[in-house]
Structure formats: C-alpha cells, structure tokens
Amino acid sequence: AVNGTSQFTCFYNSRANISCVWSQDGALQDTSCQVHAWPDRRRWNQTCELLPVSQASWACNLILGAPDSQKLTTVDIVTLRVLCREGVRWRVMAIQDFKPFENLRLMAPISLQVVHVETHRCNISWEISQASHYFERHLEFEARTLSPGHTWEEAPLLTLKQKQEWICLETLTPDTQYEFQVRVKPLQGEFTTWSPWSQPLAFRTKPAALGKDT
C-alpha cells in the first residue's frame, strides 16, 4: 500500500507526445507503475512505463504516433491515470482529465546556426520542432547569451513576443567566444510552460581590424 501525498503533472508537446511526472511521498518498493492515456474522442489509447528519476518521482513519455503527426485537437480531453500493480491487480494511484492544449510544453528549438557574424554582432537563426498547426504564428521565444566569465543563470533574457526564428545579437565584444540558447512557448494554454532550452550554439565574434578603435 502507498500512503502520502502524490503529484501528477503532464505536458503535451502539441503533436504526438505527452510527458508525465508522478511524485509520491510514500515508499514504493519494487512496484511496477504506468501511465494510461484514454482520449475522449479518439480511437487509440496508450500506456508508458513509469521509470524512477529520483527517490520519490517517476517519469514517462506517452508516444502517441509519429513525431510530427497531430494526434490531438484543441477540443480533446484525455483521461490520464497512474496505475500501479498490487499483486494481480492494478490500482489507480492518480487520475486527471487532461486538456492537452491547456498544458503545452513544446520541444526545444533545433537547428541553431550562425547566419552572419561580425565584430560586434551576430545573426542567429533556429527552427521549431514538432509544433502544431494550431499555433499558426502565436508563439513567443526567449533567448540568452553566455558571455565569458558568467553563468547561464546570470545571462539576461531577451524576449521575442512573436514567431520570429532569428535574432541579431548586438554590442558584442570582438574576438570573443559566446554561447547562445533559445526556448519557445505557445501563447495558448492556462498551464502552458516554456520548452527546454535548446542545445547551446557556440560562436566567436570576428577580431577587430588592426589599428581601429573597438
């Protein structure tokens, strides 16, 4: 038997993946648990095996179809259950009526590349991955640049309040190594959150021309 409080949080990547984390205060020794997804309007249902990510939390990804296939709509509700094996039976440990487009977390942006670099500025572009057709242009981005001697946490956030998959970084120092990250968020959804940060893109500004002030 399991006692204690539990928390069951899931996000939809807007296409064909629901990622879930289940936290449980009480001890769970050698218990097999899974998440079961049952949509109210669709013909499929799906399960994934919960795997430990810490002493009291488990995670899994419900793969609903091919990565770019649109498996849910803005009108769908998915009943999500945490089921744990108790002897020969499955016990429902947590349940929620999940509205996918109210609980969005997109995939991190991909394909970051330097379009053009100068001594003091750098133009960078990226692409969004597995984003639904529903969003049209209703996305926003945050970006950050890692300067030498600083941490990511210290980097100021640059906000792009529209679907703009490029940025021109200004007032950079010549001949300096930088790293850049970006993340994306749909404007839709009460519980929607930012995507993970992209993989960092390393770039170096051009050296200042000899004999010129910088």
Partner: antibody, heavy 116, light 107 residues
Framework: QVQLVQSGAEVKKPGASVKVSCKAS????????ITWVRQAPGQRLEWMGD????????NYNEKFQGRVTITVDTSASTAYMELSSLRSEDTAVYYC?????????WGQGTLVTVSS | DIQMTQSPSSLSASVGDRVTITCRAS??????LNWYQQKPGKAPKLLIY???GLHSGVPSRFSGSGSGTDFTLTISSLQPEDFATYYC?????????FGQGTKLEIK
C-alpha cells in the same frame, strides 16, 4: 451491437420548441460523446453540438445562437436535443451520432417539420 | 468556421471504375478529416476516419489520403452498392463542418 434509436417525427408551428431523444445501447454510454447533426432537404449535413454523458460537458454551434440545448439522462442512456424558437428553415432530419474518431454510429434520424 | 469544399459535386461512373473525390479545407486541419456515405432516406455511414483509417466493416476498395488542406477519397473498383452521396467532414475544431456532398451516379 451499438445502436442509437431516435424518437418519431414531429410537426411544429413556428416559434414552438421540439425535443428529440436518442436512446443508446450496446456500449458504455458515459464513455463517448454524442453529437447532433441536422440535414435540411437537399442541403449538406450541419453539426449542431455535442455532449459528453460522463460529465455533462457540452459544445454548441454558435450558428444556433442559444436556441439549442443538449442534455442526457445517464440512467436511461438517452441523449436529448431541444431546439427552440423554431422557424420554417429548421425543417430538417435531425440525427444523433456517437463520436469516436468520426461519427461511427448514427440514429435513424427524426424528421422535424415546421409549418404554420 | 472552417469551410469544406468537395469536387466534383456530381459524378457519373460505371461499375468497375476507379473514382476519386476531393475535399479541400479553408485552413490546415492536419489529418482530422472523415468521409461518409449516405443513401437516400438513410443516415450517413462512416467510411474513413482520420484521413486514412478504414472504419470497421467498410470494404478495402475505399481508401483515403491527404494532409493539411487537400484530401481524397478513392474507390478502387466501383460496385453497384457504392452509388450514393459522399461527404467529407473536419473534426479539427468546433464547429465541425461538412462538405456539400458529391453525388455518385451510374453512367
């Protein structure tokens, strides 16, 4: 087997209301949306709204401007569609259907005639 | 609302023919497109769901394809019982909407 059986034909005067029933059998009534679709003579099918019997949640086509009300009686596995302030252009066959990735089972239809 | 437009509106064909009906949505509906067959005085019957899924009991001569805004229903070899009116329907968003229908007649 899954069956949806609708109430019989109705003749109504303009301004009146009509309530059509749809009795479901052969599946768990509370687990699937019931939708209502109508078809005026020679016209395309027109979605009116739907209801999830397990929760009572409803969605309506704004075209009907609050004239349509969809309800269920789960104890009788029956859905209802009421259309008020009837006008002649509401003369149509009204269908209920179960939604499961498309409308996979349909009632036989109920002809509603609005005439003075 | 999403407008659904079918073409042609009517079509004459013979038993054994291969027939294609197209459906165009006024905006991207991904794969949330269903096809129905209706005969006079009867309720529609679901043929294809989610663009290409064959509903149970529907003969394999019916197939669907497409994505985004353009979709097709194909009947590979017409049978006498296939002469009817066919409708496409989007369930991408409320209000769900139907095409105007394609009447398939015997040549």
């Amino acid at each position: 087997q899954v069956q949806l059986v609708q109430s019989g034909a109705e003749v109504k005067k303009p301004g009146a209301s009509v309530k059509v029933s749809c009795k479901a059998s052969g599946y768990t009534f509370t687990s699937h949306w019931i939708t209502w679709v109508r078809q005026a003579p020679g016209q395309r099918l027109e979605w009116m709204g739907d209801i999830y019997p397990g929760s009572g949640n409803t969605n309506y086509n704004e075209k009907f401007q609050g004239r349509v009300t969809i309800t269920v009686d789960t104890s009788a596995s029956t859905a209802y569609m009421e259309l008020s302030s009837l006008r002649s252009e509401d003369t149509a066959v009204y269908y209920c259907a179960r939604e499961r990735g498309g409308f996979d089972y349909w009632g036989q239809g109920t002809l509603v005639t609005v005439s003075s | 609302d999403i407008q659904m437009t079918q073409s042609p509106s009517s079509l004459s064909a013979s038993v054994g023919d291969r027939v294609t009906i197209t459906c165009r949505a006024s905006q991207d509906i991904s794969n949330f497109l269903n096809w129905y067959q209706q005969k006079p005085g009867k309720a529609p019957k679901l043929l294809i769901y989610y663009t290409s899924g064959l509903h149970s009991g529907v003969p394999s001569r019916f197939s669907g394809s497409g994505s985004g805004t353009d979709f097709t229903l194909t009947i590979s070899s017409l049978q006498p019982e296939d002469f009817a009116t066919y409708y496409c329907q989007q369930d991408n968003n409320h209000p769900y909407t139907f095409g105007q229908g394609t009447k398939l007649e015997i040549k």
